[in-house]
């Protein structure tokens, strides 16, 4: 057992927040400022992530964990660990390479990110349009015309004419 212990890597005793310092006879030294080690037995500490520009600090770096970033208002995270910040658009718009673009007629987006998607086609489910769609909201489907009691009128307003293109706001 003693022999096994002596063969063991002395660096394995260094806890998170420290590194095994080869320059100091493999003793465990604390991570320098702005660096961290999240696991034990590390020979170096990793540099802390810096949340600059459009990134802002969500969680400060500590000796045992990296900083975490999110995005400044008007942007949202993209990619694991918020590796990028992407511009928000308004509801009723989608982000393109050329910036925010209004949803085309017949499509909507109820979020500040993502792509405008087509309105639900109520007739595919044998239903009628109860509330017309907008750029920000999907249509609301109601009962099929046959389901309406005799004499009851459908609340479906007439379908709007094709809108002209909107310029982005």
């Amino acid at each position: 057992f003693e022999r096994t212990r002596s063969l063991q890597d002395p660096c394995s005793n260094c806890p998170a927040g420290t590194f095994c310092d080869n320059n100091r006879n493999q003793i465990c030294s604390p991570c320098p400022p702005n660096s961290f080690s999240s696991a034990g037995g590390q020979r170096t500490c990793d540099i802390c992530r810096q949340c600059k520009g459009v990134f802002r600090t969500r969680k400060e770096c500590s000796s045992t964990s990296n900083a975490e970033c999110d995005c400044t208002p008007g942007f949202h995270c993209l990619g694991a660990g918020c590796s990028m910040c992407e511009q928000d658009c308004k509801q009723g718009q989608e982000l393109t390479k050329k910036g925010c673009k209004d949803c085309c007629f017949g499509t909507f987006n109820d979020q500040k990110r993502g792509i405008c998607r087509p309105w639900t086609n109520c007739s595919l489910d044998g239903k009628s349009v109860l509330v017309n769609g907008t750029k920000e909201r999907d249509v609301v489907c109601g009962p099929s015309p046959a389901d309406l009691s005799p004499g009851a009128s459908s609340v479906t307003p007439p379908a709007p004419a094709r809108e002209p293109g909107h310029s982005p706001q």
Partner: antibody, heavy 119, light 111 residues
């Protein structure tokens, strides 16, 4: 380099379901790109099926929306497509592909997997 | 849905020829001076390969004999001097709105 490998194709009975997989290597599917599926019936053109973004928002072909489910498993770096109530006209080569950060065009494609729907 | 119509459906050409393929959209795929249209090349038994995006931008690694032009509803893919490896089927794709749609394809055959 980005590599996409589809699997799960084969012979399926009409009315059945199938789940296709697309294993990505050389790139993380949790990077922020959109990922999608496109199919091609024998001797025919390309048909766009679905997209999924980093947040898990899903976008489908209007005509196939009720029968398609796109999903992803970031831990396995794999994209999936489930297609239900299969018909003979679903016979096609199914491709997965990487799009850009806007879900527009497709810059990397898998080699495709053939699905044959027949009794 | 935006329909894309390619013409011709097929064409025969010789090595060295200048080849032009057109793609017409049922409505404009432009926004703020930008055209949301791509071109792909597909060879038999292979996956499509991106050639051109944003109507005229050449994808990295694609030979300069390929070029794209057009705006609004009318777009063109030009191969300035056809090479043996260019015999394939070419597709346009719009990404102005969902659902994304492809043209029906143009097959370029050896004369």
């Amino acid at each position: 380099e980005v590599q996409l490998v589809e699997s799960g194709g084969g012979l399926v009975q009409p009315g059945g379901s199938l789940r296709l997989s697309c294993a990505a290597s050389g790139y993380s599917i949790s990077s922020g790109h959109y990922w999608g599926w496109i199919r091609q019936a024998p001797g025919k053109g390309l048909e766009w099926l679905a997209l999924i973004d980093w947040y898990g928002d899903k976008y489908y072909s209007t005509s196939l929306k009720s029968r398609l489910t796109i999903s992803r498993d970031n831990s396995k770096n794999t994209l999936y497509l489930q297609l239900n109530s299969l018909r003979a006209e679903d016979t096609a080569v199914y491709y997965c592909a990487r799009s850009d950060y806007y879900g527009s065009h497709f810059d990397y494609w898998g080699q495709g997997t053939l699905v044959t729907v027949s009794s | 849905d935006i329909q894309l119509t390619q013409s011709p459906s097929s064409l025969s050409a010789s090595v060295g020829d200048r080849v032009t393929i057109t793609c017409r959209a049922s409505e404009s795929v432009d926004f703020d001076g930008f055209s949301f249209l791509a071109w792909y090349q597909q060879k038999p038994g292979k996956a499509p390969k991106l050639l051109i995006y944003d109507a005229s931008n050449l994808e990295t690694g694609v030979p300069s004999r390929f070029s794209g032009s057009g705006s609004g509803t009318d777009f063109t893919l030009t191969i300035s001097s056809l090479q043996p490896e260019d015999f394939a089927t070419y597709y346009c794709q719009q990404y102005d709105t969902l659902p994304r749609t492809f043209g029906q394809g143009t097959k370029v055959e050896i004369k």
